[in-house]
């Protein structure tokens, strides 16, 4: 922590400008009051201030608003937002999408991960839910951003605006995200075609169920096998192989290349060795002929 | 454009590890697999094993298994693969390949790492 | 694993000849699952043909691929200079994944 001196008459600050960067630490301070600079914080990122310098300065706001920043503030921290902690940017109440922007322009290049997701999320509470404006602001100035919210969050996500939300946008979407948004992409695209349905839902099958799985490989989509690796094991493993060898269509002979790798893998193991041995691709691992397989699950489950 | 831009080279002792990373631009990360390919001082090339990116799933060639481990980091659309308990025949320019999932040829390859294993 | 051995070793033409490079694998390859490389000096490899015959994307026609089983091959129609280079076999019908050794054309 910054020690307190009284400020020399000389250093007394009236306005926010250049000559504060020949301030020292501990001049900074004595000498800049807080509430001023709260008022005249447009003028900051325009200073080419150090980093030691900007600490205190974060120091002097931490001192006015230990509840937390208010948006007039935040809107204009400039790169004094690369100062700010998760736990410090948990404290604000973000309403204005030109705030998220301009913090998530100079966040970009920076480690900044955990405090881009807790903004994000901060706005989405701020603003009740994720509307289309915030999606398509995070789609444009953070492409991969929408997958830092929670599964809690990303529920407020009506329907109607999946649409605008692009491949590269769900790239680093987990399962459980997955889970939640592949029923909003359904309906939301129930109306379409087959075969420009597949191509809408196709980076929100991560969250698909069996059945919806099983009923794509009766529409000749030829799935990728990009797509089919990102499905649910839990999701892949009741596929039979005529099943997968229709759902993935001309795209069959990669899971050859891909049979070391799961959900591959743990779906060759539940097959029957004639029954991959059909598909003429050396697959091996099936259960082989005249095998019986208990469900044991199932007697526990009963008794 | 696609792009494959690997770290730089590398200086090790015997019996110390290194890490090797691969930031991939230009492309969806999670549709292609990343191979690591390596190749000794006017030798061939030999296959270390891959990582897909979507799963965190990696498969590795045997020769290198326990020493090897591949690691992805889809929020900065970056592989790393670390190879420990160097040994001088380490030595070799290592290479991060990108494989369109369900393919197992390389169509994008980084630039090369040199690794240099030395007492 | 499957042992693909490349030959010749060396192959020494002149700009303008037929260059037939050689791949033979130890057990038989999906022929799917065949590709050649070329890579130059302080280069990294680059992708020739995929699919055994397959031509890689910006790849002149004068390269060609073909074969099946244990028997592949690599053709340049008519050699200009810039294909003076190393190129390499690789398989991956069978893992591990495996590279041939390489064949080095060179000016004669």
């Known amino acids: 922590d910054v020690e307190r001196t009284t400020c020399p008459p000389e250093k007394e600050v009236h306005e926010i400008d250049e000559s504060l960067i020949f301030y020292k630490k501990r001049e900074l301070e004595a000498c800049v009051d807080a509430a001023l600079l709260a008022a005249q914080m447009d003028r900051v990122d325009a200073i080419p201030f150090t980093y030691e310098q900007l600490d205190v300065l974060k120091h002097k706001l931490d001192e006015l608003y230990p509840q937390g920043y208010p948006e007039s503030v935040i809107r204009h921290l400039g790169h004094l937002f690369l100062k700010m902690s998760p736990e410090d940017i948990r404290k604000w109440n973000v309403t204005s999408l030109e705030t998220l922007k301009a913090l998530l322009k100079v966040s970009k290049g920076h480690e900044m991960s955990a405090q881009v997701a807790t903004l994000i999320d901060r706005v989405v509470v701020g603003r009740g839910q994720l509307d289309k404006d915030t999606v398509d602001t995070l789609t444009a100035f953070c492409p991969g951003c929408l997958c830092s919210l929670s599964p809690e969050r990303l529920s407020s996500v009506p329907p109607s605006v999946i649409g605008a939300v692009r491949p590269q946008d769900l790239d680093t979407c987990g399962p459980r995200q997955l889970d939640v948004l592949y029923p909003k992409a359904r309906l939301a695209f129930q109306n379409m075609s087959g075969s420009e349905y597949f191509v809408k839902i196709r980076p929100f099958l991560g969250g698909a169920p069996t059945e919806d799985v099983k009923a794509l490989s009766q529409q000749n989509v030829s799935m990728d096998l990009a797509t089919f690796m990102k499905l649910r094991r839990e999701a892949v493993l009741p596929l039979t192989v005529a099943e997968v060898q229709k759902l993935l269509g001309p795209h069959v002979e990669g899971l050859k290349v891909e049979e070391q790798h799961s959900p591959v893998r743990d779906w060759i193991l539940k097959q029957r060795q004639d029954d991959l041995d059909t598909l003429g691709l050396g697959l091996q691992g099936g259960i082989p002929n005249g095998y019986l397989i208990l469900d044991l699950s199932v007697r526990e489950a009963l008794s | 454009e696609v792009q494959l831009v690997q770290s730089g080279a590398e200086v090790k002792k015997p019996g110390a590890s290194v890490k090797v990373s691969c930031k991939a631009s230009g492309y969806t990360f999670t549709d292609y697999n990343m191979d690591w390919v390596r190749q000794a001082p006017g030798q061939g090339l030999e296959w270390m094993g891959d990582i897909n990116p979507s799963t965190g799933g990696t498969i590795y060639n045997q020769k290198f298994s326990g020493r090897v481990t591949m690691t992805e980091d889809k929020s900065a659309s970056t592989v790393y693969m670390e190879l420990s308990s160097l040994r001088s025949e380490d030595t070799a320019v290592y290479y991060c390949?990108?494989?369109?999932?369900?393919?197992?040829?390389?169509?994008?390859w980084g630039q090369g790492t040199t690794v240099t294993v030395s007492s | 694993e499957i042992v693909l051995t490349q030959s010749p070793a060396t192959l020494s033409l002149s700009p303008g000849e037929r260059a037939t490079l050689s791949c033979s694998a130890s057990s038989s390859v999906i022929s799917s699952y065949l590709s050649w490389y070329q890579q130059k000096p302080g280069q990294s490899p680059r992708l020739l043909i995929y699919r055994t015959s397959n031509l890689a994307s910006g790849i002149p026609a004068r390269f060609s691929g073909s074969g099946s089983g244990t028997d592949y091959t690599l053709t340049i129609s008519s050699l200009e200079p810039e294909d003076f280079a190393v190129y390499y076999c690789?398989?991956?019908?069978?893992?591990?994944?495996?590279f041939g050794g390489g064949t080095k054309v060179e000016i004669k």
């Open positions: 390949a990108r494989r369109r999932i369900g393919t197992g040829y390389f169509d994008v």
């Open positions: 690789h398989q991956w019908s069978s893992f591990p994944y495996t």
